[in-house]
């Protein structure tokens, strides 16, 4: 790290070290030899999240319902608002500036991981012995029916999209 002229939480102005403004406050005037740094609290719907020398506070993020957004955590003078997506939707980026509908897993695929407000549905192909016959954002691959346990036999083999079809056993007379 290069050397710094001031202490932590200070800044250099006109060869003078001045205190930075604390989070939640903005700079009104720099210190002088005889006066301290003057800071003012951020207004309603504004914030600053670091020790700073900003002359303007940042606006809280707006969670636009037209983009599928809603407030997850209300902002304070020291923190920004955190947005998330409405039920059934997820964020398109880490910043969560817009939302898209969770994708459904097509027949032949099941849900490996259900979507959250920040991640999409993760699908996986149904392996041998499992099937999914619906397009769903929640359904996992289901195991084929076990005909044997019902004292039945397989009449039609299952696929990744269909269950097996069971039927009665042929009885020898």
């Amino acid at each position: 790290e290069p050397p710094t002229a001031c202490r932590e939480k200070q800044y250099l102005i006109n060869s003078q070290c001045c205190s930075l403004c604390q989070p939640g406050q903005k700079l009104v005037s720099d210190c002088t030899e005889f006066t301290e740094t003057e800071c003012l609290p951020c207004g309603e719907s504004e914030f600053l999240d670091t020790w700073n020398r900003e002359t303007h506070c940042h606006q809280h993020k707006y969670c636009d319902p037209n983009l599928g957004l809603r407030v997850q955590q209300k902002g304070t003078s020291e923190t920004d608002t955190i947005c998330t997506c409405e039920e059934g939707w997820h964020c398109t980026s880490e910043a969560c500036e817009s939302c898209v509908l969770h994708r459904s897993c097509s027949p032949g695929f099941g849900v490996k991981q259900i979507a959250t407000g920040v991640s999409d549905t993760i699908c996986e192909p149904c392996p041998v012995g499992f099937f999914s016959n619906v397009s769903s954002a929640f359904e996992k691959c289901h195991p084929w029916t076990s005909c044997e346990t019902k004292d039945l036999v397989v009449q039609q083999a299952g696929t990744n999209k269909t269950d097996v079809v069971c039927g009665p056993q042929d009885r020898l007379r």
Epitope: E1, P3, T4, A5, C6, R7, E8, Q10, L12, S15, Q16, C17, C18, S19, C31, T32, E33, T35, E36, T37
Partner: antibody, heavy 126, light 107 residues
Amino acid sequence: QVQLVQSGAEVKKPGASVKVSCKASGYTFTGYYMHWVRQAPGQGLEWMGWINPDSGGTNYAQKFQGRVTMTRDTSISTAYMELNRLRSDDTAVYYCARDQPLGYCTNGVCSYFDYWGQGTLVTVSS
Amino acid sequence: DIQMTQSPSSVSASIGDRVTVTCRASQAIGSWVAWYQQKPGKVPKLLIYSASKIQSGVPSRFSGSGSGTDFTLTISSLQPEDFATYYCQQANSFPITFGQGTLLEIK
């Protein structure tokens, strides 16, 4: 009462490293910057840098950049200064010195040293 | 870096004398100056900070003044225990810099 107790004298060969310790007592160790100042025989005082024991943040004089490392162990209220690649002109008494309280300074850097360690003589000689 | 130039580099004086040591900064530094006393083989002792504030426990015969670039340490009536080396130090910005020292000797 406030005390800064330093480790004992060291004799080192050129190119070696030395690590000096400074154990603080009688006050809240994490509440004050700790500085290191050295004094060559018959010479004046030379500032080397500081460590914030609370955050671990450091600031070194340009002259010592890349050769000095200041660390601390808050569990035993001790600050350390390690100087590498020693030369004969590093022969000096090394002092730790306590600064003003962390929240106290509003302009200037307020680095007035009210308490000093007893000093550690480091002799660099082949 | 801010240079601190002390004068004189040495001064001889007698008990009871008034002694003045000056320090000039290479740029304006407000009132961010300290003065230290150091006796041979001893640790520096803070006498004055913020140019004119006297450190707790320091005798009132020591005083400091000045702002901007010119600073003064005054000992109003020299006592036997005052014979030592005196250093000024700027605390305006890092790197901290000291004057080269003024040796106060018995005449």
